[in-house]
Amino acid sequence: MMTGTIETTGNISAEKGGSIILQCHLSSTTAQVTQVNWEQQDQLLAICNADLGWHISPSFKDRVAPGPGLGLTLQSLTVNDTGEYFCIYHTYPDGTYTGRIFLEVLESSVAEHGARFQIP
């Protein structure tokens, strides 16, 4: 039975040209996290394998940095980066948990940042 829950940074906004941290946190389960895939709509951004480390998709290498933790940092944001992002936690034996984050990239110099949290 899947008992875990995913907390995410929720809906966030950032300025064009700036950077943002996407973070998810899986809690309330003892399942082993084998891999976390980060996706934008239906496109792979990055993979963090618990044992083997990070892989950044070639088309995002210039603008995506791993971390902090299992999170992902997006840099040099453009308006085209606006949209849904998913953290997909592949766990054993539970299965797959998915978290959703909506990012809005604003032209304006006043971008309200949604609540963010630090994972200890």
Partner: nanobody, 116 residues
Amino acid sequence: EVQLVESGGGLVQAGGSLRLSCAASGIPASIRTMGWFRQAPGKEREGISLITSDDGSTYYADSVKGRFTISADNAKNTVYLQMNSLKPEDTAVYYCAWTTNRGMDWGQGTQVTVSS
């Protein structure tokens, strides 16, 4: 329905070689990674090798680096693990796992036993 079938395990002497295969059927188009994990008695399942579908990057655990080689035949939907210079500590059940944009699927496992 996704099916992963491993083969190639068995009993081998230390220093020997084995080649594991994992044939997949029913996998959706958006494959992300293909990998090999292993689980020794009383231990957690650990990732030992991974190949990505976007650019074929390969990753290895330090414990197998230089001895194991992962490869994929996309036309056959099959991933391989060539294991050379096997050691008794490589004894485990070996599982293949594929991730897609929908989830992760596991094979049933194949036993590898390395005798000294």
